[in-house]
C-alpha cells in the first residue's frame, strides 16, 4: 500500500513537475528589466527563451521572435537545449510511468517489469529534472554577468549632455517557476526510484534444509532468489535488484495589466 | 469612433477647487489610459499624470500630485480631475486625451477652460 | 525630466515648399527591447486639441496625409512636410512618451509666408 501510495505521488509530483518544465520553457518572462533604481519608462521590457516582449502603459504589448539561430548567444541555445532535454525525458518518463503504476493492470506484466518500469521513469525524471534546473541556472547566471557588466557602464560614459540609460534585465518568472518545476521533477523522480524497491517481488525466504541423498548432498540456503510469480512453470533465477536509494548532489532550489507607482 | 466630451468652462475663485469632467464614448472606456493635459499661453503643453479606470490606479507627475487629483466612474465611462487649491497660475485649458500605440495621444476632449479669479 | 527642444519656435514658408522642422531630447527616447523611438508629433490648430500625427517617431497615423513623414532616432527628431498646403498652418509639437513624466517640446509656429 505504501508502495503505491509513495508511486503514485511520485507520479503525480513529477506530472506537476514537468507541467511546470513546459509552463517555464514557453514563458516569456525570463528576463524582465529591471525598474529599481531606474528612471521609470513607460515601457515594459521582458525576455523569453524565444522571442522578446515590450509592454508599453499604453497596454499595447508587442512581441517579437528570435528569427535567427546563428545570431544568438550560445548560451541561450545551450538553456533551449538543456529544457528541451528535460521535457523529452520527462515526457518519456510519464509515459513509461504510468505504465508502470501499481493500480494499472496491462495484461500478465509482471511486478518485476513493473519495479524496472518504475525505475526507469525515476531516472528520466531525476534526469529531467536536472536539465531544468540547470538551464534555469545557466540563464540566471548569464542574467547576474550582463546585470552588473551593464550596470558599470551605465556610470561611465555619462559626460555629455544626453544621458542613454541602458536597459538592465533582472530575474523573471519563469526562472522561479522553472526552479520550482525542476525541484518537482527532481523528487518525484526519488520518489519513483524509492517506490521501485519495494515493487520488486518480495523474495520467498526458506529454512536451510539439509537433504541427503544417496549419491552426494545438496544444501539449500535461503534467499538469493526471487519467487517466481507467474503463470506456469518459470525456471528461470531472477536476479535480486538492490533498489537502495542513490545519493544525489543535493541542488537548492531558490524561490497586470499595469504597473503602477 | 472613440469620443470624448468634456465638461464646459468654469470660473473659480482663487483657493477654491474645481472638478471637471470627461465623458467617454465608442471604446471601452476600462480598457485604456486616460490622461490629462494642461495647456497655458506662457507653459504650453504639460502632462498632469493619467488613470487606468479598469482599477482605478494613477500615475502622476510629479509637479501635479497634491495639486490634482484623478478619478473615474466606469458606470458612466467618465473620468474627473478635480484642481485644488486655485490659483492664478492654475488658469489653463485642460484636455483628457486617451492613449495608443507608442504611448502617444489619439483622441483628445475639446478641453475646459478654467479661469482663476481673485 | 526629459527636456524637449524645439527648433525653430516660428517658421514662415510657402505652400508647395518643403518644410523640417526639429525636435532634440536631453534623454535617449530609443528602448533597446524593440528598437523604438517613443517620440509623438502632434499638430494643433487654434481653438482645437492637439491631432496625432506621428507616433514612434516615423509611424504614421492613419488618415494623416502621405506629405506628413517623422526621421530620427535617440536624442534627435525631424518632422518634414514635403509640400507644404495651407491647411498645414499650426503649431506642431513633439512629444517624449518614454520616460515619466511624458513632456512637450514648446513648439513651432508654421506660417504662411
Known amino acids: 500500500m505504501a508502495v503505491t501510495a509513495c508511486q503514485g505521488l511520485g507520479f503525480v509530483v513529477s506530472l506537476i513537475g514537468i507541467a511546470g518544465i513546459i509552463a517555464a520553457t514557453c514563458m516569456d518572462q525570463w528576463s524582465t528589466q529591471d525598474l529599481y533604481n531606474n528612471p521609470v519608462t513607460a515601457v515594459f521590457n521582458y525576455q523569453g527563451l524565444w522571442r522578446s516582449c515590450v509592454r508599453e502603459s499604453s497596454g499595447f504589448t508587442e512581441c517579437r521572435g528570435y528569427f535567427t539561430l546563428l545570431g544568438l548567444p550560445a548560451m541561450l541555445q545551450a538553456v533551449r537545449a538543456l529544457m528541451i532535454v528535460g521535457i523529452v525525458l520527462g515526457a518519456i518518463g510519464l509515459l513509461v510511468s504510468i505504465f508502470a503504476l501499481k493500480c494499472i493492470r496491462i495484461g500478465s506484466m509482471e511486478d518485476s517489469a513493473k519495479a524496472n518500469m518504475t525505475l526507469t521513469s525515476g531516472i528520466m525524471f531525476i534526469v529531467s529534472g536536472l536539465c531544468a534546473i540547470a538551464g534555469v541556472s545557466v540563464f540566471a547566471n548569464m542574467l547576474v554577468t550582463n546585470f552588473w557588466m551593464s550596470t558599470a557602464n551605465m556610470y561611465t560614459g555619462m559626460g555629455g549632455m544626453v544621458q542613454t540609460v541602458q536597459t538592465r534585465y533582472t530575474f523573471g518568472a519563469a526562472l522561479f517557476v522553472g526552479w520550482v518545476a525542476g525541484g518537482l521533477t527532481l523528487i518525484g523522480g526519488v520518489m519513483m526510484c524509492i517506490a521501485c524497491r519495494g515493487l520488486a517481488p518480495e523474495e520467498t525466504n526458506y529454512k536451510a534444509v539439509s537433504y541427503h541423498a544417496s549419491g552426494h548432498s545438496v544444501a539449500y540456503k535461503p534467499g538469493g532468489f526471487k519467487a517466481s510469480t507467474g503463470f506456469g512453470s518459470n525456471t528461470k533465477n531472477k536476479k535480486i535488484y538492490d533498489g537502495g536509494a542513490r545519493t544525489e548532489d543535493e541542488v537548492q532550489s531558490y524561490p497586470s495589466k499595469h504597473d503602477y507607482v | 469612433q472613440a469620443y470624448l466630451q468634456q465638461s464646459g468652462a468654469e470660473l473659480v475663485r482663487s483657493g477654491a477647487s474645481v472638478k471637471m469632467s470627461c465623458r467617454a464614448s465608442?471604446?471601452?472606456?476600462?480598457?485604456?489610459?486616460m490622461h490629462w493635459v494642461k495647456q497655458t499661453p506662457g507653459q504650453g503643453l504639460e502632462w498632469i499624470g493619467y488613470?487606468?479606470?479598469?482599477?482605478?490606479?494613477?500615475y502622476y507627475n510629479q509637479k501635479f500630485k497634491g495639486k490634482a487629483t484623478l478619478t473615474a466612474d466606469t458606470s458612466s465611462s467618465t473620468a474627473y480631475m478635480q484642481i485644488s487649491s486655485l490659483t492664478s497660475e492654475d488658469s489653463a485649458v485642460y484636455f483628457c486625451?486617451?492613449?495608443?500605440?507608442?504611448?502617444?495621444?489619439?483622441?483628445w476632449g475639446q478641453g475646459t477652460l478654467v479661469t482663476v479669479s481673485a | 525630466d526629459v527636456v524637449m527642444t524645439q527648433s525653430p519656435s516660428s517658421l514662415t514658408e510657402k505652400t508647395g515648399e518643403k518644410v523640417s522642422m526639429s525636435c532634440k531630447s536631453s534623454?535617449?527616447?530609443?528602448?533597446?527591447?524593440?528598437?523604438?523611438?517613443?517620440l509623438t508629433w502632434y499638430q494643433q490648430k487654434p481653438g482645437q486639441p492637439p491631432k496625432l500625427l506621428i507616433y514612434w517617431a516615423s509611424t504614421r497615423e492613419s488618415g494623416v496625409p502621405d506629405r506628413f513623414t517623422g526621421s530620427g532616432s535617440g536624442t534627435d527628431f525631424t518632422l518634414t512636410i514635403s509640400s507644404l498646403q495651407t491647411e498645414d498652418l499650426a503649431v506642431y509639437y513633439c512629444?517624449?512618451?518614454?520616460?515619466?513624466?511624458?513632456?512637450f517640446g514648446a513648439g513651432t509656429k508654421l506660417e504662411l509666408k
Open positions: 465608442g471604446y471601452t472606456f476600462t480598457s485604456h489610459n
Open positions: 534623454q535617449s527616447l530609443l528602448n533597446s527591447g524593440n528598437q523604438k523611438n517613443y
Open positions: 512629444q517624449n512618451n518614454y520616460r515619466y513624466p511624458f513632456t
Open positions: 488613470i487606468y479606470p479598469g482599477n482605478g490606479g494613477t
Open positions: 486625451a486617451r492613449d495608443y500605440y507608442g504611448n502617444s495621444f489619439v483622441y
